[in-house]
């Protein structure tokens, strides 16, 4: 079932929520206003004295001894205890035991490039999206999702991996960015802040949202994630901003209601299958797209990012649950798990709709639009 649409004519205006009926007074929060920030984020967006752990965009692949075409995923490395809050975007260190898994965290030393040189690349994510400067590409057609409405069985693994909450997706979820650009969904996870501090990774004209969902996909041209890493278009992530609305989102509640079971770092639970598409905005035709990277080590580039124009709305109670329930390493809350925005370095963000033409709720003075580069190829 499709989610209701709101303000679909305004870039990043209006969200969708899982229910049409408002709840009682107790459950109807006022909306929060996301902060405006510079890149990198301002002081308010950095973890505080108790720096909090972050998350990994990419699930690890099974060892090569396993079935070659398997899309089963292992969890990411655990994170270090939090430390200095000043540079949340590029921090990590090697596992002292010397295995392949890197222990990294948001905030503190050493910088992420020491864990993965790609983190110092020129085309990194997340980025600040400026609708006025986006290139309108009519060839960017509505996204196509197939098989995202999962039955209750088999159940799915929901895990607190110390830097995010991650839902592992079964085979069969197909997504197309356009003709010949086909992908399979692997996992989804969230980024969030804390009450009073927004935590989306991408920003819009410096405006950070309360949270962000990422659905990570592997190109059908590759059998394994490690083969796709760093390859242009090898991975694709669908991203949507989460903001506060006046109703409980019933789709998200199916996951949020289970977070207490996985409060402890490294814990996991099984949840019934659900409609994964209901976690995303209803408007698949209006989005921004650019080529970037994973937002955590290994920070591999070549990732196609699709950021929905429409937002998804959760109630304040649900956002509180998301940011207050989980714990990371070192007895620290799992919060503020986002990377600072990275420079575009000449990249042009494309839009599937005329985002720069007097339609943005945060529109600046009119700017000459960039020309469409991709033409939907």
């Amino acid at each position: 079932q499709r989610l209701p649409r709101m303000q679909e004519d305004s870039p990043l205006g209006g969200g969708s929520s899982g229910e049409d009926d408002p709840l009682g007074e107790e459950d109807l929060p006022s909306e929060e206003d996301s902060p405006r920030e510079e890149d990198p984020p301002g002081e308010e967006d950095l973890p505080g004295e108790e720096d909090l752990p972050g998350e990994e965009d990419l699930p690890e692949v099974k060892p090569k001894s396993e079935e070659e075409g398997s899309l089963k995923l292992e969890d990411l490395p655990t994170v270090e205890a939090p430390g200095d809050p000043q540079e949340p975007q590029n921090n990590a260190h090697r596992d002292k035991e010397g295995d392949d898994q890197s222990h990294w965290r948001y905030g503190g030393d050493p910088p992420w490039p020491r864990v993965s040189p790609a983190c110092a690349g020129r085309f990194q994510s997340p980025v600040d999206i400026r609708p006025q400067l986006a290139a309108f590409c009519p060839a960017l057609r509505p996204l196509e999702l197939l098989g995202f409405q999962l039955p209750p069985l088999p159940e799915l693994r929901l895990r607190n991996n110390g830097h995010s909450v991650q839902l592992t997706l079964p085979p069969g979820l197909e997504m197309a960015l356009g003709p010949g650009r086909e992908y399979r969904a692997l996992q989804l996870h969230l980024h969030w802040g804390a009450a009073g501090r927004p935590g989306s990774e991408h920003t819009v004209e410096g405006h950070r949202f309360p949270a962000e969902i990422h659905v990570v996909h592997l190109s059908t041209a590759f059998a394994r994630v490690d083969e796709a890493l760093g390859r242009p278009g090898g991975l694709a992530v669908l991203a949507a901003f989460l903001e506060e609305g006046p109703e409980e989102n019933s789709a998200y509640e199916q996951l949020l209601s289970r977070l207490e079971e996985i409060a402890e770092e490294g814990s996991e639970t099984q949840v019934p299958g659900l409609d994964i598409s209901a976690l995303l905005p209803s408007d698949f035709s209006r989005y921004f797209q650019y080529e970037g990277s994973l937002t955590t080590p290994p920070c591999a580039q070549g990732v196609i990012w699709t950021v929905f124009n429409q937002t998804v709305m959760l109630s304040a109670k649900q956002l509180h649950t998301l940011s207050d329930t989980l714990w990371g390493p070192g007895d620290s809350r799992l919060q503020l798990n986002f990377r600072a925005t990275q420079p575009l370095n000449g990249r042009v963000i494309e839009a599937s709709f005329p985002a720069g033409v007097d339609s943005s709720p945060r529109a600046a003075e009119p700017v000459q639009l960039n020309s469409c580069l991709a033409a939907g190829d």
């Epitope: 303000q7 969200g15 802040g193």
Partner: antibody
């Protein structure tokens, strides 16, 4: 409900800490806001605190003038002054505040604490 | 800070008759999600304020349906369809679209 501490009479330069105790709801999951009402005047928003992690936000008019704190273990929020002035004489209300990032509607109010500062 | 301006500041009313209070903000209170970050409170004599309306037009629980809120952007109105004696007091509009909330000066409603 929110129950505030009793009326206070203080001298200029003295310190003061008034309290607001919540019950009947999950205290740590809502912001607590503080509102001042000077005699015969309107409402002024002072600031808010999120009891879960004691994150605070102040009105620019009150930043540095007062300190808002909370102890979630006893479901209590506090408003304190290190050095009172006669102009701090007012009724002070605490209010349960909705919202996640932003402040929001205030749907449950304390009965108010009257603070009188006079030499 | 966003400045909230109410009018009138005093409103004599007749029981059974309608009443209307206006509130204007110096900046738009519409959030990107389409909701107006404005609420209305009534402070009866000698009492704490009580929430009447939030998000511009949503009635709080327990509030009689004779109270309604309308408006969007910078102009908002609180209407009482049929004033009752218990409705006397000071009415405040309150914006929470900025990081620092502000209230209107208040409108004193009294029976003629």
């Amino acid at each position: 409900e929110l129950v505030q501490s009793g009326a206070e009479v203080k001298k200029p330069g003295e310190s003061l800490k008034i309290s607001c105790k919540g019950s009947g709801y999950s205290f740590s999951k809502y912001w607590i806001g503080w509102v001042r009402q000077m005699p015969g005047k309107g409402l002024e928003w002072m600031g808010i605190i999120y009891p879960t992690d004691s994150y605070t936000r102040y009105s620019p008019s009150f930043q540095g003038q007062v300190t808002i704190s909370a102890d979630k273990s006893i479901s209590t929020a506090y408003l304190q002054w290190s050095s009172l002035k006669a102009s701090d004489t007012a009724m002070y209300y605490c209010a349960r505040t909705h919202g996640y990032y932003k402040n929001g509607r205030m749907d449950v109010w304390g009965q108010g604490t009257l603070v009188t500062v006079s030499s | 800070d966003i400045v909230m301006t109410q009018s009138p500041l005093s409103l004599p009313v007749t029981p059974g008759e309608p009443a209307s209070i206006s509130c204007r903000s110096s900046q738009s209170l519409v959030h990107s999600n389409g909701y107006n970050y404005l609420s209305w409170y009534l402070q009866k004599p000698g009492q704490s304020p009580q929430l009447l309306i939030y998000l511009g037009s949503n009635r709080a629980s327990g509030v009689p349906d004779r109270f309604s809120g309308s408006g969007s952007g910078t102009d908002f109105t609180l209407k009482i369809s049929r004033v009752e004696a218990e409705d006397v007091g000071v009415y405040y509009c309150h914006q929470y679209g900025d990081f620092s909330d502000t209230f209107g000066q208040g409108t004193k409603v009294e029976i003629k």
